[in-house]
Interface confidence: medium
């Protein structure tokens, strides 16, 4: 599933993102566009041997179990497939931990280079919340 | 326990396209990519790509773009190669293995001939 | 794309003999090496995975060592089951790449 940007805001908010350890829904639905555009499929590989899946791309050598990265911690405890899912709730439930682990959204490295210290309001702007 | 079964032996004309199976049972399909191997005598093993076929996430190696194409079916714990325009340079045996990084688990393999 | 190099392409031993298999990288490719055995019109079998780790079920007389470009598949004490086609194959970057094997044979 293609997410619209207010779409995903609007689910993204249902979830419990919004402020989830001090970042705005803004700063979810940024790193969202810049990891995946918003696209639940979304999946890249990486030159370590591990993938990145969902619509906000998270490690398989971390994060989620794929069966074939090298030394997989999957710390989420979930296969990297119901990250693709057109619903949302693993990957947000995912993203928490993550975000809980000490970095916060500097895990990902689209938000970083992308959205950190950008005007994030911006991809809320005009949706109904 | 793992298993993944091929489809039996094609025997294909020049310009033809066929569609090989590979069944997969005893573990979760939907959770792990399934690749597609080719052997032809003197010329060794060669990856074409891979499947997730919970998603439908594809990925080809550049050689196999054009020629092979990747489906699969969650319902039967199917996965499907489709090869398109087939030449001489096609005929070889086609394995599908679950991926792993390594490959532990492997079809029985499928030969396909070429042949006008 | 990273191209495997076996060494040697044929080998014909006795039975009883200890052996080794060279597989060499065209670039480091940490330990991400498999090796797998495969008989005339069966399917590959895998014997070693990250260059060291024996399989399940497969004889203790199978071991693999090697780390960045060198790899070695050593059988110590050569049965009659061991003849056939050896591969190595990487999975450090895709595309996943094989050597072009080596044939071990009844001398």
């Known amino acids: 599933k293609v997410f619209g940007r207010c779409e995903l805001a609007a689910a993204m908010k249902r979830h419990g993102l919004d402020n989830y350890r001090g970042y705005s829904l803004g700063n979810w639905v940024c790193a969202a566009k810049f990891e995946s555009n918003f696209n639940t499929q979304a999946t890249n590989r990486n030159t370590d041997g591990s993938t990145d899946y969902g619509i906000l791309q998270i490690n398989s050598r971390w994060w989620c179990n794929d069966g074939r990265t090298p030394g997989s911690r999957n710390l989420c405890n979930i296969p990297c497939s119901a990250l693709l899912s057109s619903d949302i709730t693993a990957s947000v439930n995912c993203a928490k931990k993550i975000v809980s682990d000490g970095n916060g959204m500097n895990a990902w490295v689209a938000w970083r280079n992308r959205c950190k210290g950008t005007d994030v309001q911006a991809w809320i702007r005009g949706c109904r919340l | 326990q793992v298993q993944l079964q091929e489809s039996g032996a094609e025997v294909m004309k020049p310009g033809a396209s066929v569609k090989i199976s590979c069944k997969a049972t005893?573990?979760?399909?939907?959770?792990?990519?399934i690749e597609w191997v080719k052997q032809r005598p003197g010329h060794g093993l060669e990856w074409i790509g891979e499947i997730l076929p919970g998603s439908g996430s594809t990925y080809y190696n550049e050689k196999f773009k054009g020629k092979a194409t990747f489906t699969a079916d969650t319902s039967s714990n199917t996965a499907y190669m489709q090869l398109s325009s087939l030449t001489s340079e096609d005929s070889a045996v086609y394995y599908c293995?679950?991926?792993?990084?390594?490959?532990?688990?492997w079809g029985q393999g499928t030969t396909l001939t070429v042949s006008s | 794309d990273i191209e495997l190099t076996q060494s040697p392409a044929t080998l014909s031993v006795t039975p009883g003999d200890s052996v080794s298999l060279s597989c060499r990288a065209s670039q480091s490719i940490s330990n991400n090496l498999h090796w797998y055995q495969q008989k005339p019109h069966e399917s590959p079998r895998l014997l070693i995975k990250y260059a060291s780790q024996r399989e399940s079920g497969i004889p203790s007389r199978f071991s693999g060592s090697g780390s960045g470009t060198d790899f070695t598949l050593s059988i110590n004490s050569v049965e009659t089951e061991d003849f056939g086609m050896y591969f190595c194959?990487?999975?450090?970057?895709?595309?996943?790449?094989f050597g072009g094997g080596t044939k071990l044979e009844i001398k």
């Open positions: 194959q990487q999975s450090n970057s895709w595309p996943r790449t």
């Open positions: 005893g573990y979760t399909f939907s959770t792990y990519w």
């Open positions: 293995a679950r991926g792993d990084g390594w490959y532990c688990y």
